[in-house]
Interface confidence: low
């Protein structure tokens, strides 16, 4: 009696169980009563990552430099190419189809966490006693200058965007 279900790594066709092609290979012809399934390796720029009965291999992903992408891991006959973003960019989405520039933290904000290839810059407001006067993707909030340690006095208070201004102490004679 012809089978109605097949074992793992097999598929049912014409009332018989044929072996699936292994990862990295595509189906050329189904098995028959007398012949095994015929499979062929994927070409250099293609892959198949599962046991399959596909007649075409999938094209490796193209890491398009015009989208800010570069190859992180070259594809094989069994795996797709993995793209990552160029320096200064991070992936738009999990699939990393394109990249966007890291955002800069504006004056008054410092970098809490530097961006990576997959996550954007995280900024934080500069707390009292700290400032940032630049728009930067790397700089943290910097502490106000300590006038006392320089034997000077505060002439102008600092803000979250500006450092304190120190000046000489008025000496009483």
């Amino acid at each position: 009696e012809p089978p109605t279900a097949c074992r793992e790594k097999q598929y049912l066709i014409n009332s018989q169980c044929c072996s699936l092609c292994q990862p990295g290979q595509k189906l050329v012809s189904d098995c028959t009563e007398f012949t095994e399934t015929e499979c062929l390796p994927c070409s250099e720029s293609e892959f198949l990552d599962t046991w399959n009965r596909e007649t075409r291999c999938h094209q490796h992903k193209y890491c398009d430099p015009n989208l800010g992408l570069r190859v992180q891991q070259k594809g094989t006959s069994e795996t797709d190419t993995i793209c990552t973003c160029e320096e200064g960019l991070h992936c738009m989405s999990e699939s990393c189809e394109s990249c966007v520039p890291h955002r800069s933290c504006l004056p008054g904000f410092g970098v809490k966490q530097i961006a990576t290839g997959v996550s954007d810059t995280i900024c934080e407001p500069c707390p009292v006693g700290f400032f940032s006067n630049v728009s930067s993707a790397f700089e943290k909030c910097r502490p106000w200058t300590s006038c006392e340690t320089k034997d000077l006095v505060v002439q102008q208070a600092g803000t979250n965007k500006t450092d304190v201004v120190c000046g000489p102490q008025d000496r009483q004679r």
């Epitope: 398009d64 430099p65 015009n66 989208l67 800010g68 160029e86 200064g88 960019l89 738009m92 189809e97 394109s98 990249c99 966007v100 520039p101």
Partner: antibody, heavy 120, light 107 residues
Framework: QVQLVQSGAEVKKPGASVKVSCKAS????????VNWVRQAPGQRLEWMGL????????TYNQKFKGRVTLTIDKSASTAYMELSSLRSEDTAVYYC?????????????WGQGTLVTVSS | EIVMTQSPATLSVSPGERATLSCKAS??????VAWYQQKPGQAPRLLIY???DRRTGIPARFSGSGSGTEFTLTISSLQSEDFAVYYC?????????FGQGTKVEIK
């Protein structure tokens, strides 16, 4: 509102070159690719190529066989398209159009167009 | 190069009616198709990208669908300002290629 402002109309003789400029107002080109598209009278739109301001990388439509050169001046937020060895069939409106990386090559902002007439 | 073929060449529709425009790619372009509207003397305007994502500010009456080789732009209820030429673009592979356009005219 993002605006791309292109240079004015040009009349050129066959064999000459033309250089069209495209200035971005409100934003710099960072995070965008700049495409160039042309449209001959009554014809479909035709993509000529693009430049990535981040790294200066260019990709051209092979149809133009080295006749087109795309450049960018980031400090002036201006992109340029130069087409050489002009012939009468190059008479067209030339557009610059930008694509944000999150919409790969789906050109979302367009210049007003520059009419280039090639006539002897 | 990938050839994009639009149909019909001209579509005559009455205001308030539905318009369905078709675009076929000569090979698989996945969902990398954009739709543009162009009026005489104006630059094209992006309506839809990635086959079905409506650009910010585009009215909800415009919708896109499809994947692979067959794509559709639907305008659910035509307004007077929608009469124009519509182009599809594949942004899957170089060179990027446009369809020849569909002119939507008043019936």
């Amino acid at each position: 509102q993002v605006q791309l402002v292109q240079s004015g109309a040009e009349v050129k003789k066959p064999g000459a070159s033309v250089k069209v400029s495209c200035k971005a107002s409100v934003y710099s080109f960072t995070g965008y690719t700049v495409n160039w598209v042309r449209q001959a009278p009554g014809q479909r739109l035709e993509w000529m190529g693009l430049i990535n301001p981040l790294n200066g990388g260019t990709t051209y439509n092979q149809k133009f066989k080295g006749r087109v050169t795309l450049t960018i001046d980031k400090s002036a937020s201006t992109a340029y398209m130069e087409l050489s060895s002009l012939r009468s069939e190059d008479t067209a409106v030339y557009y610059c159009a930008s694509s944000y990386y999150s919409t790969p090559y789906a050109m979302d902002y367009w210049g007003q167009g520059t009419l280039v007439t090639v006539s002897s | 190069e990938i050839v994009m073929t639009q149909s019909p060449a001209t579509l005559s529709v009455s205001p308030g009616e539905r318009a369905t425009l078709s675009c076929k790619a000569s090979q698989n372009v996945h969902t990398r198709v954009a739709w543009y509207q162009q009026k005489p003397g104006q630059a094209p305007r992006l309506l839809i990208y990635l086959a079905s994502d409506r650009r910010t500010g585009i009215p909800a009456r415009f919708s896109g669908s499809g994947s692979g080789t067959e794509f559709t732009l639907t305008i659910s209820s035509l307004q007077s300002e929608d009469f124009a030429v519509y182009y599809c673009l594949q942004h899957w592979n170089y060179p990027l290629t446009f369809g020849q356009g569909t002119k939507v005219e008043i019936k």
